[in-house]
Interface confidence: medium
């Protein structure tokens, strides 16, 4: 008979006890505490918050709580030499300047150290030239401009609206197009929901609000000066010219009041279609340059930010496992914010704090988890996922041998409509079954399960009666754990209704208006959505750390592998002649997927039947489950992206936030019709099919009977 050796205590110490201990009122209190002043990475304020969290986690009952510090490259505006953009006349006089700061929200007028809007890691420079409007600056937007409209961005300053893709991809695309500067702005079409008032009267972006953010293209490298290794006391640092992922042209963000002044004068080509028009009362002409009367005027950028090696601090808390202390389940989220962090990250950090408190309460009553739980408060996430990546680089040997799972805990909410989950297929079953056990917080679903409301509001596109679960991309701290190390990972938060709200993210994202009051007044006054997210994240951690058999179902990986193979095959089949000419076959991949499916099915049967009272056999089966995600890692990484090593998933090369399946094959096929050497290009497709097929087959074999 199965038993739980970890517990020799009263019956009440189970997941229900853990979940019942989580309180909305505590999350609210913690959020308030974490959002009263800015906690920008590398500042004294954020160091003090790290020490406060360390102290409180110790009080909550964790076995140990340590600070882990690193010296990484960060970026700050020059306090005496502000960044701005001008319209200049033919004499070089500045006839219009963009604002130097956001008007502070009510009650925050006297707060010091509010960093003005800037694009982190922009180089210094004062380029001037004609403006070209490039829509969202996506790959397809530049294709439209350059190939269809024959507009050349070389030597131009481009203006792009935020949204759809990660801002770093926009800047990379602009650089490749030859631009000499980039202006990023928030268009009301993307950041102003109809029928909702601007902050402080609602949750919409006011005209003076601006989105901050980094513009790096790190591809998982972490600190730009120490790729692959921790930025510790004896680190060898690259020179700035060799740093990873830094932009080469000046970049600056503005709000829609300032954008109006730049865009209203635009001349040149009309927008190619309605998808290029936002909601401002401007023509959305593409340019280049201003129209008629204003054709002699130019745009000039003034960027004086500096890159500085600065100390950052992670907080790492440990709750030692009673039976398998050498198996780690990690719950991590970042602490650093651009300004107050009302949603990003402190709505997540407050939830982590309450989860730690609940686990600590159980521990004080004599309970321990079966496996070790690590809790992390990451620093410098906003500057490129630096804190989590450096810690993982420092501890990579431990993590790759002992890491069971990583659950991410950034913003708990980006809306209040329904649940949103992105995770490895290994966790689908866990998420489904956990959410069936949690009560839905949604209006109209009283007494119903979270699974029911989630499935109703966000149905799976493939499987009826099931909710949508998305692929992991990047843009958050799970990246190094999943994409580099191959540790099963997941994330959950409450989100908006994507059907009715087409704006990108939430309107006040990374602005000064992301305050405690934004959450308390407009998003979650009762903190019931925060509590639900705490239950999902905490429940996943509890089950991953405590379940005798790991709650991973390898059959779900088999299902998605077939789906992804079908998808990439259909993309390739858009070129039937070339596939024939160059003898491109997907047979090896489909064969590997078939083998994986059969072996996973047999493994699952053995998992049902084996003797769980035999600790050696139990550990063996659990190790096969734990190492399955690891088996999808290619030590050589993806082409030109050595730190993205997962063969099944990687962040899209065109949008860091999005996940792409079979990314090696996908990138080899992308725009293949435009390649100058088709033979070489299709050769690379064949090589990527070979790598994918081999990896799937090798992963399948890890699930076979061991002897």
């Amino acid at each position: 008979k199965s038993s739980n050796e970890a517990t020799n205590i009263t019956p009440k110490h189970n997941m229900k006890a853990f979940l019942d201990e989580l309180k909305a009122e505590n999350i609210k209190k913690f959020l308030y505490n974490f959002t009263q002043i800015p906690h920008l990475a590398g500042t004294e304020q954020n160091f003090q918050l790290a020490k406060q969290i360390q102290s409180q986690w110790k009080e909550f009952g964790l076995d140990s709580v340590e600070l882990a510090h690193y010296d990484v490259l960060l970026s700050y505006p020059n306090k005496t030499h502000p960044n701005y953009i001008s319209i200049i006349n033919e004499d070089g006089n500045e006839i219009f300047n963009t604002s130097l700061f956001e008007p502070p929200p009510p009650g925050y007028e006297n707060v010091s150290d509010i960093v003005p809007p800037f694009s982190a890691f922009s180089p210094q420079g004062m380029p001037e030239g004609d403006l070209v409007y490039v829509n969202y600056a996506r790959t397809e937007d530049f294709f439209k401009l350059e190939r269809d409209m024959k507009i050349n961005c070389s030597g131009k300053i481009v203006i792009a609206r935020y949204g759809k893709v990660f801002r770093g991809n926009k800047v990379k695309n602009a650089q490749l197009a030859g631009a000499k500067g980039v202006i990023l702005y928030s268009d009301p079409a993307d950041y102003f929901a109809p029928g909702v008032k601007s902050y402080p009267d609602g949750w919409n972006l006011p005209g003076g609000g601006v989105q901050r953010g980094n513009i790096l293209n790190l591809n998982g490298a972490g600190d730009p000066l120490t790729p692959g290794y921790p930025a510790n006391e004896y680190a060898y640092r690259r020179g700035i010219a060799e740093a990873v992922g830094l932009p080469s042209i000046p970049v600056h963000p503005i709000g829609y009041y300032d954008a109006q002044k730049l865009l209203e004068k635009m001349g040149g080509s009309a927008p190619p279609d309605s998808s290029w028009r936002g909601s401002l009362k401007v023509p959305y002409n593409v340019g280049p340059g201003f129209t008629g009367n204003f054709s002699t005027q130019k745009v000039k950028m003034h960027i004086h930010s500096t890159n500085e090696v600065t100390r950052i601090y992670n907080v790492i808390g440990t709750l030692r496992g009673a039976v398998e202390p050498d198996r780690y389940v990690i719950l991590g989220g970042h602490r650093d914010s651009w300004v107050f962090g009302g949603i990003d990250p402190q709505s997540g950090a407050a939830v982590v704090h309450e989860i730690v408190r609940s686990f600590g309460t159980l521990k004080k009553e004599g309970w321990r988890p079966r496996r070790t739980i690590l809790f992390a408060s990451w620093d410098a996430e906003e500057f490129g996922l630096l804190g989590s990546t450096e810690w993982a680089e420092e501890n990579s040997r431990l993590l790759q041998e002992r890491g069971v799972a990583y659950i991410n805990a950034d913003s708990s909410i980006e809306g209040n409509y329904t649940l949103r989950v992105d995770c490895t297929p290994l966790m689908y079953s866990l998420v489904h079954n956990l959410t069936k056990e949690l009560k839905s917080p949604d209006e109209g679903f009283e007494g119903k399960s979270l699974y029911e409301s989630w499935t109703k509001k966000s149905p799976s596109p493939e499987f009826s009666g099931m909710p949508r679960i998305s692929k992991l991309g990047s843009g958050n701290d799970f990246e190094v754990f999943f994409q580099r190390l191959g540790i099963a990972s997941g994330r959950a938060r409450y989100t908006k209704n994507w059907e009715t709200n087409k704006f990108s993210g939430y309107p006040l994202y990374h602005s000064v208006y992301e305050t405690y009051e934004l959450v308390e007044k407009f998003y979650d006054p009762m903190f019931k959505y925060h509590l639900t997210v705490a239950q999902v994240r905490g429940g996943m951690v509890f089950e991953l750390a405590n379940s005798i058999v790991l709650p991973f179902d390898c059959r779900d990986y088999a299902v998605v592998l077939r789906k992804y193979a079908d998808k990439i095959y259909s993309i390739s089949m858009k070129h039937p002649q070339e596939m024939k000419t160059y003898s491109v076959s997907f047979d090896s991949l489909f064969s590997a997927v078939k083998n994986f499916t059969e072996i996973a099915s047999k493994f699952s049967e053995r998992l049902q039947d084996f003797d769980k009272s035999n600790p050696i056999v139990l550990r063996m089966m659990n190790d096969q489950l734990m190492f399955l995600e690891r088996a999808f890692i290619d030590p050589l990484g993806l082409p030109d992206r050595p730190f993205y090593r997962h063969v099944i998933y990687a962040p899209s090369s065109h949008n860091k936030y999005a996940g792409e399946s079979f990314p090696g094959i996908y990138d080899a096929l992308f725009d293949i019709e435009s390649k100058v050497d088709p033979s070489k290009a299709w050769g690379e497709v064949k090589r990527q099919i070979y790598v994918a097929a081999f990896t799937v087959q090798a992963a399948a074999e890890t699930l076979s009977e061991v002897a």
């Epitope: 199965s2 517990t7 020799n8 019956p11 079953s429 056990e437 399960s449 379940s547 769980k612």
Partner: nanobody
Framework: QVQLVESGGGVVQPGRSLRLSCAAS????????MGWVRQAPGKEREFVAA????????LVSDSVKGRFTISRDNSKNTLYLQMNSLRAEDTAVYYC???????????????????WGQGTQVTVSS
């Protein structure tokens, strides 16, 4: 180990009611699903009903739907089966079962590796 002790069985006339109880003790930590399985003389074990730890998820077999109700009192670590409108074909030994599977596709499907009680006899006879 987990001990499961059933009670409440007996002889009853058709159309009448019985309430079975199952008290769980020992290391009941991590028990997510509890349920009832019955075995009539000379027949295979048959699933009757199951309930998850939150009580949000209950499953009752088609053969007893509308007549039997399963419930659980976590504070007392006790499982109940309210049996109404009993029929002769409900005669069987009723076993309480418990599982620590949260994640299986068939969460209600008890097998030999789960915890079982000794059973209580229910006889429906006029």
């Amino acid at each position: 180990q987990v001990q499961l002790v059933e009670s409440g069985g007996g002889v009853v006339q058709p159309g009448r009611s019985l309430r079975l109880s199952c008290a769980a003790s020992g290391r009941t930590f991590g028990i997510y699903v509890m349920g009832w399985v019955r075995q009539a003389p000379g027949k295979e074990r048959e699933f009757v009903a199951a309930i998850s730890w939150s009580g949000l998820n209950r499953l009752v077999s088609d053969s007893v739907k509308g007549r039997f109700t399963i419930s659980r009192d976590n504070s007392k670590n006790t499982l109940y089966l309210q049996m109404n409108s009993l029929r002769a074909e409900d005669t069987a030994v009723y076993y309480c079962a418990a599982s620590n599977r949260l994640y299986g596709r068939t969460w209600y499907d008890f097998n030999e590796s789960d915890y079982w009680g000794q059973g209580t006899q229910v006889t429906v006879s006029s």
